[in-house]
Amino acid sequence: EVEKTACPSGKKAPEIDESLIFYKKWELEACVDAALLATQMDRVNAIPFTYEQLDVLKHKLDELYPQGYPESVIQHLGYLFLKMSPEDIRKWNVTSLETLKALLEVNKGHEMSPQVATLIDRFVKGRGQLDKDTLDTLTAFYPGYLCSLSPEELSSVPPSSIWAVRPQDLDTCDPRQLDVLYPKARLAFQNMNGSEYFVKIQSFLGGAPTEDLKALSQQNVSMDLATFMKLRTDAVLPLTVAEVQKLLGPHVEGLKAEERHRPVRDWILRQRQDDLDTLGLGLQG
């Protein structure tokens, strides 16, 4: 906490400008009017303040707005946002997507911090829904965001939002989440031709039912083993040896290396040995 001292004569700041970088912490505290700072927050980012100086500016805003900053100030926080704690952020009422974007931009390229997580949760909770624009914004900044959502929340995601999803965005999704996302992806990509459709749907197949896998096996898709290993065990078990062979195409040889792992292990145990032998891989049921 900075001690209260009178502002030296002639140092009272008429506006927020570069001259303030030469002010000591106590001078900033004494000579910068908090209300002026609040109205000229957009200038702070253009000035190379030290972390210690930013602490003073934050302290001034905290004193001015003990119940939480207004959105007009929040939108222009810029790098000062990095100084905020989750406790500070939970006092805010951010309703504008533009404000959210401005704050996410500050943290761009970094992992989702507790501050950002609190901001996002409060924003979405305050809206009471995860609309397309919000979801598209969040997945643009945090590609893995989709897999942090509950199956319940994902159920309200519009199929149109699925278009922007990249395969790596789904890396951390669990089967329950893919169960919800797969039918949406199927709907979103339904008008694409066979090979294009498979490229798009491939990363969602962890939620596909048996009948869809059977249909894919008729389309010469050559599914790779990594995708096959992510399929639902209950969806793979009813597939015949011929269907799996068609589904995997030249990748069928990879079954041997995965024979002790699910779902391959469980699928092998369900097949007749005569059928497995037709693959010529030495798989034992």
Epitope: A117, V124, K125, R127, G128, S148, S150, P151, E152, R176
Partner: antibody, heavy 116, light 107 residues
Framework: DVQLQESGPGLVKPSQSLSLTCSVT?????????WNWIRQFPGNKLEWMAY???????NYNPSLKNRISIIRDTSKNQFFLRLNSVTTEDTATYYC?????????WGQGISVTVSS | DIQMTQSPASLSASVGETVTITCRTS??????LAWYQQKQGKSPQLLVY???TLENGVPSRFTGSGSGTQFSLKIDSLQPEDFGTYYC?????????FGGGTKLEIK
């Protein structure tokens, strides 16, 4: 401020249907959120029963699925619970609540007794 | 369905003490957990959502933590108004289920 208020009969006979209304003020039920029914049994155990979402879609607790329905009247900003074939086991305090990541607004609850 | 195991079922403590209530889930719910406080004859009140975010107006002596299947609610420096029953609830997928409750009584 969002306010929720339950209304309906305090006493229902076994095998009959229970119908409850939740009236919402201060927020449109079509603008956002999940609008839930929860009940609390005499031993204080809480049970989530159903929700109707802002977009009109709904979801039920499978333990009640074959005898429960939830609908809404957007013109009156109300949503309703209907529970069929009630038994004495359905005696509880029934709450309506608004939720997203948690049930942040609740009605004061209505006590319902099932008895002949 | 995801089962919620809350412990202890009851707890006696004095004003000024620190207490911790735990909630274990039968499946991974990431951080989709809420904590409530209920006073006799009143509706439950949301304290914490997404495992650790305090609801508006909730004093900072309440702290939620955990993710996956293990969660806890810590109350520092208990105040007279903190006594009541506490419940956890998951929001991962329906049916949403509640813990059995922890009755916090004044010693």
């Amino acid at each position: 401020d969002v306010q929720l208020q339950e209304s309906g009969p305090g006493l229902v006979k076994p095998s009959q249907s229970l119908s409850l209304t939740c009236s919402v003020t201060g927020y449109s039920i079509t603008s956002g959120y999940y609008w839930n029914w929860i009940r609390q049994f005499p031993g204080n155990k809480l049970e989530w029963m159903a929700y109707i979402r802002y977009d009109g879609s709904n979801n039920y607790n499978p333990s009640l699925k074959n005898r429960i329905s939830i609908i809404r009247d957007t013109s009156k900003n109300q949503f309703f619970l209907r529970l069929n074939s009630v038994t004495t086991e359905d005696t509880a305090t029934y709450y309506c609540a608004k939720s997203y990541y948690g049930m942040d607004d609740w009605g004061q609850g209505i006590s319902v007794t099932v008895s002949s | 369905d995801i089962q919620m195991t809350q412990s202890p079922a009851s707890l006696s403590a004095s004003v000024g003490e620190t207490v911790t209530i735990t909630c274990r889930t039968s499946g991974d719910i990431h951080n989709y957990l809420a904590w409530y406080q209920q006073k006799q004859g009143k509706s439950p009140q949301l304290l914490v959502y997404k495992a650790k975010t305090l609801e508006n107006g909730v004093p900072s002596r309440f702290t939620g933590s955990g993710s996956g299947t293990q969660f806890s609610l810590k109350i520092d420096s208990l105040q007279p108004e903190d006594f009541g029953t506490y419940y956890c609830q998951h929001f991962w997928t329906t049916p949403y289920t509640f813990g059995g409750g922890t009755k916090l009584e004044i010693k």
